[in-house]
Each structure stands twice: as structure tokens, then as C-alpha cells.
């Protein structure tokens, strides 16, 4: 499938610090009413930690103690059940770790399996089990800088999951992306997590961010769009190439042709030949012989060089590098001069009884 250029996202301007969210199912901590529960935030290098319960900021109170990376709940009640999160804020990014707390009367030694089942229910997004947003396929969101030809359509997608089902909104260059921000607006399909912009123009260049959020968290992804406009032109041949060359009989020579073309160029090497002593046909066009053309197994580099081995006097003459694309044709020519080999008798071209 024909595609578009993709550049690894390595040399971009710094953005807002990214946020990492766990995609795996959260751990479940079980306690009986009245028991105390202590949970450690399982994040490394946690400089500043903030806590939430069911998406709401959690502060210390007479039963909740927050010390460093530990959360303590004293005298747990069923109302303490829910989805908890600790977020570690760092200078370069932030990371969130989720866990479930289940305070229930019916605890027995066989309930560990049930707890696991509960976690699986959470993953399958049962209405009872909540989950912060997550990307359904992170691998497809790694390359982020895209060049698209003007006048075509761009589709951004950020497929995600979560429970409750997250909502999606879009930013352009960090600000809310409104319909009136571009001629023709844009189209959104929330069920496909997609945004479409038709007939893109250079002013559509920029950073497009999808923000996917529910009450338990928020994730975002930024696409960097470049809209490429091009004035079409026929191939450009490097000045001075091919260059005139001279060699002796039996020697080797090479002509080089450097071709620059946006559209796929078709390159040929042509020799001007004589027919019946004439270089031109009755129609005034030159007699030409194609020596080399791009084939299925020929690379651009191979076709740009014409090698002539073991040169003879017949190889002398005009050689043309011709390059064409969908827009037009360009050509440059060069001359090959063939000199007699030193120390050899010159070829006799006159009558046999004439001796030098």
C-alpha cells in the first residue's frame, strides 16, 4: 500500500511532561470492616505523591493517614471500597498506579480467588468495576510525525478503553480545537475514536492531541502533522553531469548522471548513432540507441552510472542521460573521445596500398 513519510519523533520541541498510566489490571486489597489497611505506592523515584479515590483527591483525615509512599486506612468500612490511585510527579513525566480496595464482611480463606476474579471483571469493564482510560494498541502510536500531501484527507485515531467509557476531545497546538479554527471544520467519530480533516492545507500543520478521559484518569497522545505542498517539476539533472570524457582504445570509461525528482523518474542512457552515414532521419529527429534503462532489478544508483568497458573507436560520440517523470523530461549530454592506444599501430582506415 502506498504510504506517506514517517519520521521518528526524536527532534521535536519539548511538550508538556507526558503521563504514564498502567494498562495491566490493578491489584485488589481486601480488608474486613474495622480492620486497618496499609498500601504502599508501587512507583519508583516518587518525589511528590498525590492520592485519589474514585477519581477524587484524597487528603489525610482522622482515619486516613498519608505518609510518604504509604496510605493507611484505619478502621475500614465498606465505604472505603473503591478504585484508588497514587500519582508520582517528576520533572520529566508523571506516572499513575491504580489499585482496588474491597472492604467486605464475607472474607474467608478461599476468597483470594474471588479477588482475582474481581480484578478480571475490572479488565472486562463490568459496570461494577471501574478503570481509567488506556490505549488499546500502544504499538501503533509510536511514530508520531507524519507528512501528508496537501489537498488530501487526514485521519487521526486514538482508540482507547476504560470504564466508564472515556470521552475524547481534541487540541491543536495545546489549545481546544474548534470547528471554526479551519475552513471546512473537521469531523469526529467517537465510536471509532477518530477525527478527520478534509482537503488539508499548509495552515493545518501542527500538533494534534487527543485527550481521552473518564472520572478515573486521563491519557493523551500527540500527532505531529506536516502538510507538504509541492510545485511539480520535471526531473532536475545536476549541472556538469555527465561530463565529457576521453579514453584510449581498450580503456574503460564511465558517465555519471545525478537525477533529482519528486515523482518517480524513469532514466535512460542513449547514444546518438549514424544510419546510412546520417545522424538524423527524414523527419529531422536524431537516430538514437537506448543503451541502458531502469528495469525491475535496477536500482537508482546503478542507472545513474553508465559504464563502457574495453572502448573501441565506434564508442566515440554523444551520450545522453534522459530522465522523465509524470511532469516532463530533462536531458544532459556529454561526448566521449576515443584516442589511439599509445605504442600501437594506428588503425588503417585508408586504402590498403597506402602505408604511413
Amino acid at each position: 500500500r502506498p504510504s506517506f513519510s514517517l519520521v521518528e519523533d526524536t527532534t521535536l520541541e519539548p511538550e508538556e511532561p507526558p503521563t504514564k498510566y498502567q494498562i495491566s489490571q490493578p491489584e485488589v486489597y481486601v480488608a474486613a470492616p474495622g480492620e486497618s489497611l496499609e498500601v504502599r505506592c508501587l512507583l519508583k523515584d516518587a518525589a511528590v505523591i498525590s492520592w485519589t479515590k474514585d477519581g477524587v483527591h484524597l487528603g489525610p483525615n482522622n482515619r486516613t493517614v498519608l505518609i510518604g509512599e504509604y496510605l493507611q486506612i484505619k478502621g475500614a468500612t465498606p465505604r472505603d471500597s473503591g478504585l484508588y490511585a497514587c500519582t508520582a510527579s517528576r520533572t520529566v513525566d508523571s506516572e499513575t498506579w491504580y489499585f482496588m480496595v474491597n472492604v467486605t464482611d464475607a472474607i474467608s480463606s478461599g476468597d483470594d480467588e474471588d479477588d482475582t476474579d474481581g480484578a478480571e471483571d475490572f479488565v472486562s469493564e463490568n459496570s461494577n468495576n471501574k478503570r481509567a482510560p488506556y490505549w488499546t494498541n500502544t504499538e501503533k502510536m509510536e511514530k508520531r510525525l507524519h507528512a501528508v500531501p496537501a489537498a488530501n484527507t487526514v485521519k487521526f485515531r486514538c482508540p482507547a478503553g476504560g470504564n466508564p467509557m472515556p470521552t475524547m476531545r481534541w487540541l491543536k497546538n495545546g489549545k481546544e480545537f474548534k470547528q471554526e479554527h479551519r475552513i471546512g471544520g473537521y469531523k469526529v467519530r467517537n465510536q471509532h475514536w477518530s477525527l478527520i480533516m478534509e482537503s488539508v492545507v499548509p495552515s493545518d500543520k501542527g500538533n494534534y492531541t487527543c485527550v481521552v478521559e473518564n472520572e478515573y484518569g486521563s491519557i493523551n497522545h500527540t500527532y505531529h502533522l506536516d502538510v507538504v505542498e509541492r510545485s511539480p517539476h520535471r526531473p532536475i539533472l545536476q549541472a556538469g553531469l555527465p561530463a565529457n570524457a576521453s579514453t584510449v582504445v581498450g580503456g574503460d570509461v564511465e558517465f555519471v548522471c545525478k537525477v533529482y525528482s519528486d515523482a518517480q523518474p524513469h532514466i535512460q542512457w542513449i547514444k546518438h548513432v549514424e544510419k546510412n552515414g546520417s545522424k538524423y532521419g527524414p523527419d529531422g529527429l536524431p537516430y538514437l540507441k537506448v543503451l541502458k534503462a531502469a528495469g525491475v532489478n535496477t536500482t537508482d544508483k546503478e542507472i545513474e552510472v553508465l559504464y563502457i568497458r574495453n572502448v573501441t573507436f565506434e564508442d566515440a560520440g554523444e551520450y545522453t542521460c534522459l530522465a522523465g517523470n509524470s511532469i516532463g523530461i530533462s536531458f544532459h549530454s556529454a561526448w566521449l573521445t576515443v584516442l589511439p592506444a599509445p605504442g600501437r599501430e594506428k588503425e588503417i582506415t585508408a586504402s590498403p596500398d597506402y602505408l604511413e
Epitope: R1, P2, S3, F4, L6, K140, M141, K143, H146, V148, P149, A150, A151, N152, T153, V154, K155, F156, R157, C158, P159, R189, Q191, H192, S194, I196, Y223, L225, E229, R230, S231, P232, D262, A263, Q264, P265, N325, S326
Partner: antibody
Framework: EVQLVESGGGLVQPGGSLRLSCAAS????????ISWVRQAPGKGLEWVGR????????NYADSVKGRFTISADTSKNTAYLQMNSLRAEDTAVYYC????????????????????WGQGTLVTVSS | DIQMTQSPSSLSASVGDRVTITCRAS??????LAWYKQKPGKAPKLLIY???FLYSGVPSRFSGSGSGTDFTLTISSLQPEDFATYYC?????????FGQGTKVEIK
Amino acid sequence: EVQLVESGGGLVQPGGSLRLSCAASGFTFTSTGISWVRQAPGKGLEWVGRYWAWDGSTNYADSVKGRFTISADTSKNTAYLQMNSLRAEDTAVYYCARTYGIYDLYVDYTEYVMDYWGQGTLVTVSS
Amino acid sequence: DIQMTQSPSSLSASVGDRVTITCRASQDVDTSLAWYKQKPGKAPKLLIYSASFLYSGVPSRFSGSGSGTDFTLTISSLQPEDFATYYCQQSTGHPQTFGQGTKVEIK
């Protein structure tokens, strides 16, 4: 206003050749493309091939590969369908259509959509 | 090649009816599906692209849905000018392929 006008159709013998033209106005080929689609009498639509101006590439259906060639003269805003070694089963109305790409940045491919079509030209291959 | 199968092949309906045409792909085409409408002796016209996006100028009574292998074109309230043949077409695979068409006739 975008317009596409096909010409060059007619009656040709099996094994013969024909060149169809598609003259476009109201847009330039520079960034988009031209597709050819045919429709045999009383039958459905069959995609023949596509010329993509951005990189000059062409793609063909297996049924015509090696026999048909799509080209374009962007200075004239005209696309061509050169049809060689014609067979009876190539008999159809041939349409050219302006084609644009939907660049899906998530899955990294281009979906091709034909939004403006010509009126069609009939090619009859018969002895 | 990816085969596209439309159903039904033809249907009879009255003005004002809600009409649904389905299109099934022989393999996953994601959302890379378009719908076209063709009247006898005329060129096809684009209705829907990318499975669910209405092409500009197309009346809002037309809608598309689906992804993967199963797609639907719905006409919410059939109008006299809607009696025509409808084709689905995928372009995720090479070559692009059309469904065999669904003819919508007047009951």
C-alpha cells in the same frame, strides 16, 4: 467546479489497442490521483488501476496488469489509459475518477477514495 | 483479493421507508470502506467514506457504520431520487474491490 471528461472509446478488434484520455478541470493532479474503473454491460463496477501524482506511481488490477498502462501529462491535466492486447472481456464503459487519499496516521496507510467521476466512454472489443 | 459481498442483491421499498444494506468483507478492512450510488446510464457518486463519514453534499438521511468485516449503509427515509444501485468498496487491500451491488427498486 471539478470536471472529468473521458474520450477515445470505440470499437476495436481482439488483440488491438486503444488509448483513452481523461481531461480534468477544476483541480490539479499535483497531490491527488486518477483512477480508472470499468463496468461491463449489465454488470458491477471493477477497479482497473490508479495513477498517484504525488510520486508518479501506478497500480493495476491483476486482470489488466501487463496489458494496460496508466500515465498522465500534468501540464495538460490529462490522464491516459493505454490498452493493449484487448480481449472481448475488456468490453465495458470506462470511467476515470478523481482520487484522493485518506492518510490514516494511526495504522500508517492510505485509503483511496474516488470522489468525482467522468461520464464514461464505451470500449467494445469484438471481431 | 478481498471479496466484498453485499446483501440483499435487490430490494423493493416505498418512499419514506428506512432501508438498510449490508456489506461483508472476506477479511478485516478496518474502516477503509466507501459507499457509492449509481443510477442507470450514469457515473457512480460517492456517498460515504471511511465507513461512517458522510461525503460533502450528500443528504444526512444517508449514514454508514461498521468496521472490520461488517458494514451497513442506512437510508433513514427513502426519497424518489434514492432508487438506484448501491456499491460498497474497500481500499485497504490491493486491489481495491467493489461489492456486486444492491439494487433499490420502487415497491
